[in-house]
């Protein structure tokens, strides 16, 4: 006879799994808010700043009520990957003005990366279909000026803040339905 069977694989408690993801998301949300406030203090900027390469915001009126877990996690992962790429780009090409936001931008990048790995783990633990590998994204053009880099930073941090809020609200709402 072969070796005795191993212990049965414990299926994860989806609420606990979601919980730890929400925790990381909330923590990153607080970091992002703080960094955005720091940026506003150093480089005040009026009005909304947009960057065409950023993902469009995930939520529209009424959409939260119809959310399903696979859709939320897939969309969130795709959007956060884009933000990670933009934060990396900002650190590399943002110019000397944005060096004043280090080491905080570096910490934000590391935490964003950690949340992405956590989402990947959650999706595999919950046996959700894995999204296909992302096609290589075209490189982001360097900002045209120092002020262009600052405007981009406002857009990136503002968009990330809203995306993380959408994520926390969506994930907590889904948790109530589990």
């Amino acid at each position: 006879p072969g070796p005795p069977p191993g212990p049965p694989r414990v299926s994860p408690d989806p609420r606990a799994e979601l919980d730890s993801t929400v925790l990381l998301t909330r923590s990153l949300l607080a970091d992002t808010r703080q960094l955005a406030a720091q940026l506003r203090d150093k480089f005040p900027a009026d009005g909304d700043h947009n960057l065409d390469s950023l993902p469009t915001l995930a939520m529209s009126a009424g959409a939260l009520g119809a959310l399903q877990l696979p859709g939320v996690l897939t969309r969130l992962r795709a959007d956060l990957l884009s933000y990670l790429r933009h934060v990396q780009w900002l650190r590399r090409a943002g110019g000397s003005s944005l060096k004043t936001l280090e080491p905080e931008l570096g910490t934000l990048q590391a935490r964003l990366d950690r949340l992405l790995r956590r989402l990947q783990l959650l999706m595999s633990r919950l046996a959700l279909p894995q999204p296909p590998p992302d096609p290589p994204a075209p490189p982001l053009a360097p900002p045209s000026s120092a002020w262009g880099g600052i405007r981009a930073a406002h857009a990136i941090l503002g968009g990330l803040h809203l995306t993380l809020d959408w994520a926390v609200r969506g994930l907590l709402l889904l948790k109530t339905r589990l």
Epitope: D19, L23, T25, R26, S27, L29, A30, R33, D48, L57, A58, M59, S60, A61, G62, A63, L64, H161, L162, L164, D165, W166, V168, R169, L172, L173, K175, T176
Partner: antibody, heavy 119, light 111 residues
Framework: EVQLVQSGAEVKKPGASVKISCKAS????????MDWVKQAPGQRLEWIGD????????IYNQKFTGRATLTVDKSASTAYMELSSLRSEDTAVYYC????????????WGQGTTVTVSS | DIVLTQSPASLALSPGERATLSCRAS??????????IHWYQQKPGQAPRLLIY???NLASGVPARFSGSGSGTDFTLTISSLEEEDFATYYC?????????FGQGTKLEIK
Amino acid sequence: EVQLVQSGAEVKKPGASVKISCKASGYTFTDYNMDWVKQAPGQRLEWIGDINPHQGGPIYNQKFTGRATLTVDKSASTAYMELSSLRSEDTAVYYCARGELGHWYFDVWGQGTTVTVSS
Amino acid sequence: DIVLTQSPASLALSPGERATLSCRASKSVSTSGYSYIHWYQQKPGQAPRLLIYLASNLASGVPARFSGSGSGTDFTLTISSLEEEDFATYYCQHSRDLPPTFGQGTKLEIK
């Protein structure tokens, strides 16, 4: 000065609807969520739901799902709460409150709108 | 939903005394480093006012005599030396999960 100013008191019949407004000033309207809280006489405060003014997506306490509708007019920096199929238990003071994104604590409150439901 | 129980229901103290208000949650509202409990003060005919957020952070414009502490399921609001204007009703609120809920309140009265 950061302020939330709500519409005036309302008296409604059972089965009717009421729509309360909340005008924000002194801050960037889209930087915070707008939450709504009910305070009925002798009852604890009750969270109704919130809305993200930037994206317009509301979420509700299950207790109020289907009867409360939260909307915003970004251009007017105004949030609205409509409550339908009113009953006597809806008699309360309703507050709008500015909510920190993702954390649900409320650092600025409107003055409250009294809604009385009576036949 | 998480239930918050405040004690005592009412408390009579004199100006200058120390007030200790308690809030107990039906399950833990803390997760590594964050405690999702907030405290408000409400006076008759007025809206609530945020005093403390995330268990121990003083809200803007709130006097330093107010402080918050605790983790897990047990939290405390302390007023180190009561002033006349502190006599009011105090509520705790959690935001650990949806929906956020409030305690039933502690009424602080002048002795």
